[in-house]
């Protein structure tokens, strides 16, 4: 539906359930262990509702003793999943998220998975890794992006109002043309952001406003014929 | 889905006046502005200017100032726009449009020959 | 007034081919626009809508981006249906004004 003078406009993106991976392909495998501890931290924007897959350290499992993969949550106790592989048993501390689990088997692989990411999972997850060699980790500080619900309105003559409503992090917004802006935002229990952008424009060949939404999941754009100044009949252009 | 039907062909005299219809259809007509383009033969597109059903509130082009008159009947959801004055390079297709430009109508060909 | 000065005028593709068009906005005062085709005898079509939401219907192939002053129409790969004049509309200042066309015949 175009945008026009008075509906409300929304929109939502729609995610099919992707799948994101940061995980090294085999042939880095044998890339040397300093590369390894050279790769500590990874910050790492994941999209709500996409499956994320997080991997350890690229060492071959024949080398390995114990894998552990140690979840700290918000709010929440540190939940570990450690695999010994001498006596091929898997333990689990503190985990009640049951979208969290072992790709597949950990004595095959000992990837992580977290199937359809929520706000929730918002954390640091890392792997550790003990070898005869040593021990080596992998973290990721996970970061759960919200695509904000976008709409745009008028509420007076020549005044619009763009809303980016729960987004993560804050979705940031600009007007084409500028007009004379207020911008408010909202932050929610959930860690969301609602971001209010109300302007205003006095000149008055503005004929039609553009919102532009920008956020970390996308950009979208919105627009809207300003209705005319009260008691305005005729003027040339 | 919106609809915009235009009024017929029409054929006029150096100095007359046409007027031209569109009925609208499937949409608050009251709440979009109308806007009306014209285009002469083998040209490009050219704004004439537009009406807010809702008010009344009119904006034209400069070069139309004068010899334009848009109206429109809101219960019948239907724009006009009349030009005046007309000479012979007035001769071109005239469409209204709304939705901010995104619903057109199909066109009225104007022609203006003595 | 704002001006749009759309390039080129015209030009002549190959099938297959990729085409390019542009519209700049004058004084460089950012704006939003709509691209339509037009072929002879019809109405204006809307293709993409502000700057660069393909509409309904519309075939894939077509893709609109830009923003500010500057902003490309682009056809992926020309079909021979494509033959028609485009055009750009900025919308955000009255008046509106249209790109003077670009005709776009097929080799």
């Known amino acids: 539906q175009p945008n026009n003078s008075l509906m409300l406009q929304t929109s939502k993106e729609n995610h099919a359930l992707a799948s994101s991976s940061l995980c090294m392909d085999e042939k880095q495998i044998t890339q040397n262990y300093s590369k390894v501890l050279a790769e500590v931290n990874t910050s790492w924007p994941v999209k709500m509702a996409t499956n994320a897959v997080l991997c350890c350290p690229p060492i071959a499992l024949r080398n390995l003793i114990i894998i552990t993969w140690e979840i700290i949550l918000r709010g929440q106790p540190s939940c570990t999943k450690a695999y010994k592989k001498e006596t091929n048993e898997t333990k689990e501390t503190n985990c009640t998220d049951e979208r969290i689990t072992w790709v597949s088997r950990p004595d095959q692989n000992s990837d992580l998975q977290i199937r359809t990411v929520a706000i929730t999972h918002d954390g640091y997850y890392r792997c550790i890794m003990v070898t005869p060699d040593g021990n080596f980790h992998r973290g990721y500080h996970l970061q759960v992006l919200v695509t904000p619900e976008v709409t745009l309105f008028q509420n007076r003559n020549r005044t619009a109002v763009c809303k980016a409503v729960a987004g993560k992090p804050a979705a940031h917004i600009s007007w084409i043309p500028e007009g004379d802006c207020a911008t408010k935002q909202e932050y929610w229990s959930n860690g969301t952001v609602t971001v209010k952008s109300t302007c205003h424009w006095e000149v008055h060949n503005v004929s039609t406003v553009t919102c532009h939404v920008s956020h970390l999941t996308g950009n979208k754009s919105l627009y809207i014929e300003l209705l005319p100044v009260p008691g305005a009949k005729k003027s040339a252009k | 889905q919106v609809q915009l039907v235009q009024s017929g062909a029409e054929v006029k005299k150096p100095g007359a006046s046409v007027k031209v219809s569109c009925k609208a259809s499937?949409?608050?007509?009251?709440?979009?502005?109308m806007h009306w383009v014209r285009q002469a033969p083998g040209q490009g597109l050219e704004w004439i200017g537009n009406i807010y059903p809702g008010s009344g509130s009119i904006n034209y082009d400069e070069k139309f100032q004068g010899r334009v008159t848009m109206t429109v009947d809101t219960s019948t959801s239907t724009a006009y726009m009349e030009l005046s004055s007309l000479r012979s390079e007035d001769t071109a297709v005239y469409y209204c449009?709304?939705?901010?430009?995104?619903?057109w109508g199909r066109g009225t060909l104007v022609t203006v020959s003595s | 007034d704002i001006q749009m000065t759309q390039s080129p005028s015209s030009l002549s593709v190959s099938v297959g081919d990729r085409v390019t068009i542009t519209c700049q906005a004058s004084q460089g005062t950012p704006i939003n626009l709509h691209w339509f085709q037009q072929k002879p005898g019809k109405a204006p079509k809307l293709l993409i809508s502000g700057a660069s939401n393909l509409e309904d219907g519309v075939p894939s192939r077509f893709s609109g981006s830009g923003s500010g002053t500057e902003f490309t129409f682009t056809i992926s790969s020309l079909q021979p249906e494509d033959a028609a004049t485009y055009y750009c509309?900025?919308?955000?200042?009255?008046?509106?004004?249209f790109g003077q066309g670009t005709k776009l015949e097929i080799k």
């Open positions: 449009l709304t939705m901010t430009g995104t619903s």
């Open positions: 499937g949409h608050t007509f009251t709440s979009y502005w």
């Open positions: 509309l900025q919308f955000t200042y009255i008046p509106w004004t």
